[in-house]
């Protein structure tokens, strides 16, 4: 999906109002220095591409993020503010239901969410630069 035509201001507002709080809650008990940020992004559409990948694509050591509250809110905000995004999710949602897994917060998942926080902050910074 090409995130170029999204309403970035609206996505930023949703992130600041609610998604950020859920990410921070997920990370509670860990320090910001516990993990190194290894994933970056260069512009707003690129940041959203990376955020989508890290949030919804299961990895061998962290398969459960898509069911978290911050992930559900991320999916909702992308569906709302990115033209045509929802139709790309119809088959993806059905596939996700089939691979539902036991919810376990592993260290790898915490590391992945730490990367997500970094990507979202980068997204906000690139937005501020444009303004």
């Amino acid at each position: 999906y090409d995130f170029t035509n999204c309403d970035f201001q609206k996505i930023e507002a949703d992130y600041l109002r609610t998604i950020s709080k859920d990410l921070i809650t997920y990370m509670s008990g860990t320090k910001s220095t516990d993990f190194n940020n290894t994933v970056s992004c260069s512009n707003r559409p690129h940041c959203l591409t990376e955020i989508q990948s890290l949030t919804f694509n299961p990895t061998p050591r962290c398969a459960s993020l898509a069911k978290e509250m911050f992930a559900r809110k991320t999916k909702a905000t992308l569906a709302l503010w990115c033209p045509g995004y929802s139709e790309t999710q119809i088959n993806a949602t059905q596939a996700m239901k089939k691979r539902r897994k036991r919810k376990v917060t592993t260290n790898k998942c915490l590391e992945q969410v730490s990367q997500l926080l970094g990507l979202w902050r980068r997204f906000i910074r690139t937005l501020l630069k444009k303004q």
Epitope: R17, R72, A79, P83, G84, S86
Partner: antibody, heavy 120, light 107 residues
Amino acid sequence: QVQLVQSGAEVKKPGASVKVSCKASGYIFTDYAMHWVRQAPGQGLEWMGTFIPLLDTSDYNQNFKGRVTMTTDTSTSTAYMELRSLRSDDTAVYYCARMGVTHSYVMDAWGQGTLVTVSS
Amino acid sequence: EIVLTQSPGTLSLSPGERATLSCRASQPISISVHWYQQKPGQAPRLLIYFASQSISGIPDRFSGSGSGTDFTLTISRLEPEDFAVYYCQQTFSLPYTFGQGTKVEIK
């Protein structure tokens, strides 16, 4: 089963406000946005706007900006649509309709409609 | 704002005939079109979503096709209960919009 039950018909004077409610049951309320659509007598469907409880956000049709407010009460699974500064051409049937925000993404269940008549 | 134009405005057909309803978008909207049926005094009812996806409980005589700007709702053999108004709707981008409707009436 999924049900959306709307409040009863209203008669209002021009310049007044109306608040229509829509009580949802049979599904997880926060998994869906609530949209509002109106239909003037003998006319087509007009999308008014939506409120998304999961994100605590709304979006309105520009035609109604400044006159409409959509809210929800998640504790009672009820959505509200308030329209202010009513005019005679606001006479219409007002529908609520749910739409999945993390799946389905379509208005698959509708309320029965609330007739609002604006007349002096 | 994406404008949807439905044609024809009215379709006069007999039971058993095939009905073909058209919906054209003012700009490409991929497959983000849904079709609703509305009978007098009733709320709209979802028939087809995302251009061609069928809904459980909807008779299979209803089918949808199209992508981009041109979409079609087909009723293979009209039953007496199918005479109603049909609306297309886009959810590609906000504000969501509806076509003006096609009335399918008994000839």
